[in-house]
């Protein structure tokens, strides 16, 4: 499955929306800096077969999407800038699903890496648990809004990698 | 390979303008701080100011406000410190470092390799 | 501001001993503590960052310790190559600070 060009441009455009959300001084925050553990072996594309990759992907995205359509975001964040982030990874979710589809006949390997799927929705639960503790301050948010631009940036390094592969 | 690339000493008069410059390179340059620490001759490390390139939002410490201002050009990677009128007391080694801002990454893991100013009459 | 205060100033050791540097914060910094080396006329060098977390590609016989406002660092035992100058810094709060140093010379 090739990924279209337009999911790459998505998931710059998502990227650029996040970066724009932010509503206070990213300065005033530094005290609520948090280690989430990043499960950066995750987006090394090179250890798995395409399909694992585009199924953490995937993930990545799916989880993304749900942090930021809780109530709890829509109070925190400014609505536009919200409603139009989320649709960039609806957009990307489709694409990713299409892929999914696409690479289950031809890769006979396990769809998933479970371990994998497993270590990204434990790192989405570390953020919530954070979330919940810090009661959704905005400061908490502001250093979740800098961890998420950080995962995405992961998240489009490896889909580069996947397209070098193609 | 990550590098902060500072531009080259310089000697200046009392009461002259200075801009010094810091290139970033093998990151993503908005993705981190920027930030600047003088070294007297013989001395200490002193921070001076932070600045964010996405935004050009930037904090400085309260013994350099208004004596210097942080700057940054986020299209070519660059990042700058200057002088509207220096003072001999400016003569120092400047370097600048980088900064993983709201990340959990280490703090000021690159580092330029220090811009020599000299003020003298 | 956060005053940081570094002890001893300078110290005199042999290559092999065991060296400990101890920096206090005028209030709790948590562990938003960094560890730096200087050698002269050289850019400062990242040792460790929050208080214990060792920066990739030090050797492991640099490590720190505490929290709060009490920090320390040790070389468990000293290179030749380790005597420089060593700064702390506190991170949790701008305007960021340094200690003012500790210079560790051959005895």
């Known amino acids: 499955c090739d990924l279209p060009q337009t999911h790459s441009l998505g998931n710059r455009r998502a990227l650029i929306l996040l970066g724009q959300m932010g509503r206070i001084s990213p300065f005033s925050c530094l005290k609520d800096r948090h280690d989430f553990r990043i499960p950066q072996e995750e987006f090394d594309g090179n250890q798995f077969q395409k399909a694992q990759a585009i199924s953490v992907l995937h993930e990545m995205i799916q989880q993304t999407f749900n942090l930021f359509s809780t109530e709890d975001s829509s109070a925190a964040w400014e609505q536009s800038l919200l409603e139009k982030f989320s649709t960039e990874l609806y957009q990307q979710l489709n694409d990713l699903e299409a892929c999914v589809i696409q690479e289950v006949g031809v890769e006979e390997t396990p769809l998933m890496n479970e371990d994998s799927i497993l270590a990204v929705r434990k790192y989405f639960q570390r953020i919530t648990l954070y979330l919940i503790e810090r009661k959704y301050s905005p400061c908490a948010w502001e250093v979740v809004r800098a961890e998420i631009m950080r995962s995405l940036s992961f998240s489009t390094n490896l889909q580069k990698r996947l397209r070098r592969k193609d | 390979e990550v590098q902060l690339v500072q531009s080259g000493a310089e000697v200046k008069k009392p009461g002259e303008s200075l801009k010094i410059s810091c290139k970033g390179s093998g990151y993503s340059f908005t993705s981190y701080w920027i930030g600047w620490v003088r070294q007297m001759p013989g001395k200490g490390l002193e921070w001076m100011g932070i600045i964010d390139p996405s935004d050009s939002d930037t904090r400085y410490s309260p013994s350099f406000q208004g004596q210097v201002t942080i700057s940054a050009d986020k299209s070519i990677s660059t990042a700058y410190l200057q002088w509207s009128s220096l003072k001999a007391s400016d003569t120092a080694m400047y370097y600048c470092?980088?900064?993983?801002?709201?990340?959990?990454?280490?703090?000021?893991?690159?580092w330029g390799q220090g811009t020599l100013v000299t003020v003298s009459s | 501001d956060i005053q940081m205060t570094q002890s001893p100033s300078s110290l005199s050791a042999s290559v092999g001993d065991r060296v400990t540097i101890t920096c206090r914060a005028s209030q709790s910094i948590n562990r938003f503590l960094n560890w730096y080396q200087q050698k002269p006329g050289k850019a400062p060098k990242l040792l460790i960052y929050a208080a214990s977390s060792l920066q990739s590609g030090v050797p492991s016989r640099f490590s720190g310790s505490g929290s709060g406002t009490d920090f320390t660092l040790t070389i468990s035992s000293l290179q030749p190559e380790d005597f420089a100058t060593y700064y702390c810094?506190?991170?949790?709060?701008?305007?960021?600070?340094f200690g003012q140093g500790t210079k560790v010379e051959i005895k």
């Open positions: 470092a980088r900064h993983p801002g709201l990340n959990w990454a280490p703090d000021f893991d690159y």
């Open positions: 810094q506190q991170a949790i709060d701008l305007p960021f600070t």
